[in-house]
């Protein structure tokens, strides 16, 4: 069963740059998971209200 | 998501062709830009990818000592340079961008001739 | 690199009919996370080419129904049922695994 969230292709293992990339099926396309601090749509900047 | 090209060039065989393509509706940041390459009655290859976030870019073998991808994200654009151009690079380029390329240039055609 | 080979170089069909396009991969596109990573264009004469089926099977946004892909890891086949006029051009797989990205040489689709 395929989830609606799962691990990126190879190709995009540096697509987020603070956190973690996950495909969403549904859209058919990569997405980024920030990790605490980081905000945008790749992650790309530091949450200055964290 | 449009994406608009630049427009035709006529070049001498040993010079050099920038071409552009320029997003609207759209940060160029946000994604990877792709460029592909298309001989006169022939297929589509993939030239490579550029990442306008940072400039990291990925070729293909075959283009990699001849293409050069940079972007400029002021502007929204992305760029491909082509050198020492020969007949073989006669060609139509296209840019398009998104996971899976859902989104095409209208293309720009390049021909090499003296 | 993945070798993609689309062994028709062209296929006539006369509108109203049904027509498959297939296409090989020289390695998996089956993902580890369940995906298979083959998409399907068509390129009209004198236009970008248009995407009309994502990870073998999904058919894109505006992409009207009569287009159908399935396949396993290694070969596919995009099938197009009730063709009509403006179904004709050159449709092309890619394998959007890993770099670097490559298409199958194309089959065009020729009306009788």
């Known amino acids: 069963v395929v989830s609606h969230f799962n691990d990126c292709p190879d190709s995009h293992t540096q697509f987020c740059f603070h956190g973690t990339c996950r495909f969403l099926v549904q859209e058919d396309k990569p997405a980024c998971v920030c990790a605490s601090g980081y905000v945008g749509a790749r992650c790309e900047h530091a949450d200055l209200l964290a | 998501v449009q994406l608009q090209q630049s427009g035709a060039e006529l070049v001498r065989p040993g010079a050099s062709v920038k071409l552009s393509c320029t997003a609207s509706?759209?940060?160029?940041?946000?994604?990877?830009m792709h460029w592909m390459k298309q001989r006169p009655e022939q297929g589509l290859e993939w030239i490579g990818r550029?990442?306008?976030?940072?400039?990291?870019?990925k070729y293909a073998p075959k283009f990699q000592d001849k293409a050069t991808m940079t972007a400029d994200t002021s502007s929204n654009t992305a760029y491909l340079q082509f050198s020492s151009l020969t007949s073989e690079d006669t060609a139509v380029y296209y840019c398009?961008?998104?996971?899976?390329?859902?989104?095409w240039g209208q293309g720009t055609l390049v021909t090499v001739s003296a | 690199d993945i070798v993609m080979t689309q062994a028709a170089p062209s296929v006539p069909v006369t509108p109203g009919e049904s027509v498959s396009i297939s296409c090989r991969s020289s390695?998996?596109?089956?993902?580890?996370?369940?995906?298979?990573?083959l998409y399907w264009f068509l390129q009209r004469p004198g236009q970008s080419p248009q995407l009309l089926i994502y990870r073998m099977s999904n058919l894109a946004s505006g992409v009207p129904d009569r287009f159908s892909g399935s396949g396993s890891g290694t070969a596919f086949t995009l099938r197009i049922s009730r063709v009509e006029a403006e179904d004709v051009g050159v449709y092309y797989c890619?394998?959007?695994?890993?770099?670097?990205?490559?298409f199958g040489s194309g089959t065009k689709l020729e009306i009788k």
């Open positions: 390695k998996s596109l089956l993902h580890r996370n369940g995906n298979t990573y």
């Open positions: 890619l394998q959007h695994l890993e770099y670097p990205y490559t």
């Open positions: 550029i990442d306008p976030a940072n400039g990291n870019t």
């Open positions: 509706d759209f940060n160029i940041k946000d994604d990877y």
């Open positions: 398009a961008t998104s996971w899976g390329f859902p989104y």
